[in-house]
Interface confidence: low
């Protein structure tokens, strides 16, 4: 519908609280270095303007697009050039180029200090003193560190964050109540951010068709009783929502997401029997619940796929008439029958089917040519199955920390040019696949594992894109979205890599390691392991294990010593010498 004033339309649809929160998220995701107070000021100005438009849609500037209004507001920031450098050049452009320019300057790894959690009493005091500012600060800090965070979902996180403080700041043991809740929100938030980052990368790097294919497969697994036309409608609407959010159109995105949740709940009889509980919840919880809902049961007596997609004489005719619709139907039919497959595997099968039809429908005898197409699927299915089986066995044998270390060594040898912090972060996340997925029965392992790995490898791809250092990473990241994981799996040791010069400073540790949390201490040790492999890429597992065991013993010994700093200095030198000898450095 055409509205005289887009800003008034969205303000009325979303309400003042959500409007202000979403504008704050949008601004913080664009100008990631700006102080909180500056953003609050900008948001208040936009909100006051929106209210004038609600009162009179014909008022001056109320007919301007949201991009124009928000872009003009962002471009009033006085320190734009000093803080953001060339991003300031965006302000010389007209819409829509200006918004595209802002989008291109979003930084997946902004140079921001780590968020340090204050004492519980300090947080509770701040929460009680000014609840509104406290919650705005949460939105701001998350949004600027995660510039692609799914904005309507961040509103849901903020609601849970508020609920945690409301409950726990009154509890007898505030810390025991609050800290586990904050840990859970942090971990879920990181996972949510990474999942959304993959959706945006899919849309921005591979286009709408790639995203729609992903959505057809996933929604068909989730709603196997829904008709193809119903799934197609949901896919179109979901694509619009994510295109908007990934494009910085957060007000439209949140509004359309609410409409989609409403539609799904009004039509749940023709979509899924699992939606009842979700649809009884308030809006933010409802949308979150629908997005996470379990797969519905498969309809009984689904006919064989071969009849329509291999045996029929009309395959090429149907394909030629509407290629994407026919391939969409194939993907829908295959996915609803296979909740046990990962989405990326289903997309590989659809791609193989498409390639076969492209070739065979131009052949002298098309039917004979594509008759055995389903046989080509077997190796594609077996590859991830075998890989998951092997890695779950390794995980069960080693436990999470040592499994992460095995992956650290594996990936450092594959792509040693990648920065150490990125290798540590990505390998630690890859290693979490074990605890996350290996506990599941066979039928749930592959969708859990391979689709999770797609999310983690996308983190590697977006971090690497900022500072490309490895042609191998660029190749695996850009050639095919669905083949990223097989591409990385297939990489062998990089024989062209020139080992890093040995630097004793890299392996010098101090007493501060003793006061770190277990997680932080692991990261220190894993950082050292990556550096070791970069120095000695040909080191065997046994050599690396021996050095790491010595290192763990050294840290434990010095942390128990009376004079810790002296111990680290003296024993550290011995450890470095012993390690050099053991690895032949």
């Amino acid at each position: 519908d055409a509205h005289k004033s887009e800003v008034a339309h969205r303000f009325k649809d979303l309400g003042e609280e959500n409007f202000k929160a979403l504008v704050l998220i949008a601004f913080a995701q664009y100008l990631q270095q700006c102080p909180f107070e500056d953003h609050v000021k900008l948001v208040n100005e936009v909100t006051e303007f929106a209210k004038t438009c609600v009162a009179d849609e014909s008022a001056e500037n109320c007919d301007k697009s949201l991009h124009t209004l928000f872009g003009d507001k962002l471009c009033t920031v006085a320190t734009l050039r000093e803080t953001y450098g060339e991003m300031a050049d965006c302000c010389a452009k007209q819409e829509p180029e200006r918004n595209e320019c802002f989008l291109q300057h979003k930084d997946d790894n902004p140079n921001l200090p780590r968020l340090v959690r204050p004492e519980v009493d300090v947080m509770c005091t701040a929460f009680h003193d000014n609840e509104e500012t406290f919650l705005k600060k949460y939105l701001y800090e998350i949004a600027r560190r995660h510039p692609y965070f799914y904005a309507p979902e961040l509103l849901f996180f903020a609601k849970r964050y508020k609920a945690a403080f409301t409950e726990c700041c009154q509890a007898a043991d505030k810390a025991a109540c609050l800290l586990p809740k904050l840990d859970e929100l942090r971990d879920e938030g990181k996972a949510s951010s990474a999942k959304q980052r993959l959706k945006c990368a899919s849309l921005q790097k591979f286009g709408e068709r790639a995203f729609k294919a992903w959505a057809v497969a996933r929604l068909s697994q989730r709603f196997p009783k829904a008709e193809f036309a119903e799934v197609s409608k949901l896919v179109t609407d979901l694509t619009k929502v994510h295109t908007e959010c990934c494009h910085g159109d957060l007000l439209e995105c949140a509004d359309d997401r609410a409409d989609l949740a409403k539609y799904i709940c009004e039509n749940q009889d023709s979509i899924s029997s699992k939606l009842k509980e979700c649809c009884e919840k308030p809006l933010l919880e409802k949308s979150h619940c629908i997005a996470e809902v379990e797969n519905d049961e498969m309809p009984a007596d689904l006919p064989s796929l071969a009849a329509d997609f291999v045996e029929s004489k009309d395959v090429c005719k149907n394909y030629a008439e509407a290629k994407d619709v026919f391939l969409g139907m194939f993907l829908y039919e295959y996915a609803r029958r296979h909740p046990d497959y990962s989405v990326v595997l289903l997309l590989r099968l659809a791609k193989t089917y498409e390639t076969t039809l492209e070739k065979c429908c131009a052949a002298a005898d098309p039917h004979e040519c594509y008759a055995k197409v389903f046989d080509e699927f077997k190796p594609l299915v077996e590859e991830p199955q075998n890989l998951i089986k092997q890695n779950c066995e390794l995980f069960e044998q080693l436990g999470e920390y040592k499994f992460q270390n095995a992956l650290l060594v594996r990936y450092t040898k594959k792509v040693p040019q990648v920065s150490t912090p990125t290798l540590v972060e990505v390998s630690r996340n890859l290693g979490k696949v074990g605890s996350k997925c290996c506990k599941h029965p066979e039928a749930k392992r592959m969708p859990c594992a391979e689709d999770y790995l797609s999310v983690v490898l996308n983190q590697l791809c977006v971090l690497h894109e900022k500072t490309p250092v490895s042609d191998r990473v660029t190749k695996c990241c850009t050639e095919s979205l669905v083949n990223r994981r097989p591409c990385f799996s297939a990489l062998e040791v990089d024989e062209t890599y020139v080992p890093k010069e040995f630097n004793a400073e890299t392996f010098t540790f101090h007493a501060d390691i003793c006061t770190l949390s277990e997680k932080e201490r692991q990261i220190k040790k894993q950082t050292a392991l990556v550096e070791l492999v970069k120095h000695k890429p040909k080191a065997t597992k046994e050599q690396l294990k021996a050095v790491m065991d010595d290192f763990a013993a050294f840290v434990e010994k010095c942390c128990k010593a009376d004079d810790k700093e002296t111990c680290f200095a003296e024993e550290g030198k011995k450890l470095v010498a012993a390690s050099q000898a053991a690895l032949g450095l």
């Epitope: 180029e97 320019c101 291109q104 921005q204 790097k205 591979f206 709408e208 790639a210």
Partner: nanobody
Framework: QVQLVESGGGLVQPGGSLRLSCAAS????????MSWVRQAPGKGPEWVSA????????RYAESVKGRFTISRDNAKKTLYLQMNSLKPEDTAVYYC????????GSQGTQVTVSS
Amino acid sequence: QVQLVESGGGLVQPGGSLRLSCAASGFTFGRFGMSWVRQAPGKGPEWVSAIDSGGADTRYAESVKGRFTISRDNAKKTLYLQMNSLKPEDTAVYYCTIGRSTSRGSQGTQVTVSS
């Protein structure tokens, strides 16, 4: 209906140049990254080069780096590939695709490099 129509191919001597064009219609061209892909006789498709939606970020296969230049004109909804210092091994059907896909949705244009 998405349509991609390539042109500009032909027969050229080794060391020569060609400029390929790809006219797009049926989708919001300026919103999508685009790629050039080629397929030599009897071989699978090979990704050649890619450009992001705004034209700022370009990527090339190792085999064409320094010789080929990808560009786009969003106003004209057209993708280009300037090919210099052509070699016999560049002989192939060249086609453009949306995103980084190597799936062929168009006829392509034949490039033959031969003396």
